[in-house]
Amino acid sequence: MMTGTIETTGNISAEKGGSIILQCHLSSTTAQVTQVNWEQQDQLLAICNADLGWHISPSFKDRVAPGPGLGLTLQSLTVNDTGEYFCIYHTYPDGTYTGRIFLEVLESSVAEHGARFQIP
């Protein structure tokens, strides 16, 4: 039975040209985290594996940095980075847990860096 829950940074905004940290946290389970996959809509961004460490997709290497922890740092943000991001926790023996973050990248005059949106 899967008892865990994923906590995320929820809906966030950031300035164009800036950077943002995407964070998820798995709680309420003793399951072992074997791997975390980070996806942007239908693109695999990065993987953190307990044995192999980090793999960043080559097409994102210039703008994606691993960490902190199991999180992911997006740099040199553009308006095209606006959208849904998913953290997919592969665990044993529970299985897979998925968290969702919505990032909005705004022109620098509009956004407060890292400001939180109210989650509906």
Epitope: L44, I47, D51, L52
Partner: antibody
């Protein structure tokens, strides 16, 4: 240099058993998921089974579930496939493959031929 | 199970031609799509992983694109050593499944 070397194939009668081995070298075997994939003569590729890095988690194709068992011995850098109740349709070349991050098969062995026939 | 449909099943082309092979998944697989090349009597060789990432040591004339359900492998300028069979494979969920293969033959 990464190397995977399968062995244990051969001719076996229907209902018989075989144990395939895949000896790994050139990398930290205990850090990688490993898979078996087969290819019947003149046909395409078919996934057979997988096992995670510590051997605690396995998966099987429906066509072999209950008959085949995948296992590994990390102290010997070796992957195994125990095949029981073999059928004619199991005739194929069997490949072992290394699968980093459980996503892609980056290294394959040369394959070992299993022929099930009376 | 996720079905992978590859097309065409075979094609004839000349050295220097641009070749495109497509693969369609029966449901969305994000970018968990890999491409392999296989020559007769040999093991498959990884070309492209995660839809668009070029495996180390693979010539840059090979490229992959797509996400969701539709994917493409392109060989920008076919070379003599590229005549082989190509397979797509999804790793989104088990059972892992392969396309039926595309045989690239000399015209």
């Amino acid at each position: 240099e990464v190397q995977l070397l399968e062995s244990g194939g051969g001719l076996v009668q229907p209902g018989g058993s075989l144990r395939l081995s895949c000896a790994a070298s050139g990398f930290t075997f205990s850090s990688y998921s490993m898979h078996w994939v087969r290819q019947a003569p003149g046909k395409g590729l078919e996934w057979v089974a997988n096992i995670n890095s510590n051997g605690g988690n396995t998966g099987y194709a429906d066509s072999v579930k209950g008959r085949f068992t995948i296992s590994r011995d990390n102290s010997k850098n070796t992957l195994y496939l125990q095949m029981n109740s073999l059928r004619a349709e199991d005739t194929a070349v069997y490949y072992c493959a290394r699968v980093p991050y459980d996503v892609w098969m980056d290294y394959w062995g040369q394959g070992t031929l299993v022929t099930v026939s009376s | 199970d996720i079905q992978m449909t590859q097309s065409p099943s075979s094609l004839s082309a000349s050295v220097g031609d641009r070749v495109t092979i497509t693969c369609r998944a029966s449901q969305s697989i994000s970018s968990y799509l890999n491409w392999y090349q296989q020559k007769p009597g040999k093991a498959p060789k990884l070309l492209i992983y995660a839809a668009s990432s070029l495996q180390s040591g693979v010539p840059s004339r090979f490229s992959g694109s797509g996400s969701g359900t539709d994917f493409t492998l392109t060989i920008s300028s076919l070379q003599p050593e590229d005549f082989a069979t190509y397979y797509c494979q999804q790793s989104y969920s088990t059972p892992l499944t392969f396309g039926g293969g595309t045989k690239v033959e000399i015209k």
